[in-house]
């Protein structure tokens, strides 16, 4: 959470940004809020990126102005125009790329004053894991798959029954490069599993942490997955 103050004569407004992460190939949001101003035509929003000449996006007089937009953002940015009057200056970013990572500035000018705040934007790839019982294996085993990760994550297994156990000797993890030659598919197999136990497959890099749980009993298989972005907010 970053709060910036701007001073214009005697006037300053509070601008707030949130560190966030973008998933390569998907759409992202760079979050920025400011003190609302009902006079839409008097609001100017400028998004800038450190090291880039030209603007990421500009919104003024109630509409976009892409005249000064840098080429790398062409056709890829939009504000939530209907939410600007209530203080939302967040930016939609289409088809996030690795090169979009960096420090962004959200600059606001309204009839009340002006202000700005910086935002650290991380980019990578992260996806939910899915665990299945691998019936093809010679012994009962579990297969954890997640389709898109970058940078290469670490993978660890845990068990409810054998808490604290190290499963690295009885698991095998591979990383397969996807067709776009950036992200990778993660596959990890855990061998010699026992029934009536809950196993967790944890995948983590510096951007996200994902966990897939599976409970195998005589009568059913229960699954659960969750994904958490790291260092956000």
């Amino acid at each position: 959470l970053i709060i910036g103050f701007g001073i214009s004569g005697k006037h300053f407004i509070t601008v707030t940004t949130f560190t966030s992460a973008g998933n390569i190939g998907e759409d992202g949001t760079l979050s920025c809020t400011f003190e609302p101003d009902i006079k839409l035509n008097g609001i100017v929003i400028q998004w800038l990126k450190e090291g880039i000449k030209g603007l990421v996006h500009e919104f003024k007089e109630g509409k976009d102005d892409l005249s000064q937009q840098h080429e790398m953002f062409r056709g890829r940015t939009a504000v939530f125009a209907d939410q600007v009057v209530v203080g939302n200056a967040s930016l939609r970013l289409k088809n996030v790329q690795l090169t979009d990572a960096g420090t962004y500035t959200c600059y606001i000018r309204t009839s009340k004053g002006k202000g700005n705040a910086n935002l650290e934007y991380k980019t990578g790839a992260f996806s939910m894991p899915e665990i299945n019982v691998d019936y093809n294996a010679s012994s009962e085993s579990l297969r954890c798959e997640a389709p898109r990760w970058f940078p290469q994550p670490t993978v660890a297994w845990a068990s409810q029954v054998d808490q604290g156990a190290n499963f690295s000797e009885v698991s095998n993890t591979s990383f397969e490069l996807n067709s776009e030659n950036v992200t990778m598919k993660v596959v990890s197999v855990l061998y010699n599993v026992t029934i009536n136990n809950t196993y967790s497959c944890m995948i983590e890099n510096d951007i996200a942490k994902a966990t897939g749980d599976i409970k195998v009993t005589d009568s059913e298989v229960k699954r659960r997955s969750q994904l958490q972005l790291l260092n956000s907010g």
Partner: antibody, heavy 120, light 108 residues
Amino acid sequence: QLQLQESGPGLVKPSETLSLTCTVSGGSISSSSYYWGWIRQPPGKGLEWIGNIYYSGSTYYNPSLKSRVTISVDTSKNQFSLKLSSVTAADTAVYYCAREGSYTTVLNVWGQGTMVTVSS
Amino acid sequence: EIVLTQSPGTLSLSPGERATLSCRASQSVSSSYLAWYQQKPGQAPRLLIYGASSRATGIPDRFSGSGSGTDFTLTISRLEPEDFAVYYCQQAASYPLTFGGGTKVEIK
């Protein structure tokens, strides 16, 4: 309702420059929400995006044609233009102008197209 | 650039039949940025579907789009005589904008 109309010579000699103009009517070319683009279609073949321009004059070209393409805009006439230099027979095509959403980048209004033949 | 491959090249069907056209991308494309166009002989292409599944203004509901990632489909539920044409998919995720090679839907 918005309409686009291409105009220009139907015959261009090899090595010369192809020049076309698109006139926008029923709306302003200075709209902040759109790019104005050119697309071409060789006889019996598919569509190829050439590039686009914003009303302020900023452009983006297809890398495969970038060295030969210039797109310009004249807001006072509500027109934008295409120039393609050093043409060969491979540039023979129907050339379309179109309106492109600045974020959706979908081509939602097209001109009817104009056939340009490159021949001596 | 993103390469789009359409199949089949030609689809021979009768009026009233169902048409299923495929578009495959060389890399994952967000479903928000896949469009379909219809082109009749001597005419400019016309936008049919945007965002993979949203119909453009004035497009009949017999046209529907679906898909995500690298595989997208245009379906015409019951072919009308005016639907026999060439159909193109287009990716709008990144520049340069690219089109598939087209599928011709012809009368059987």
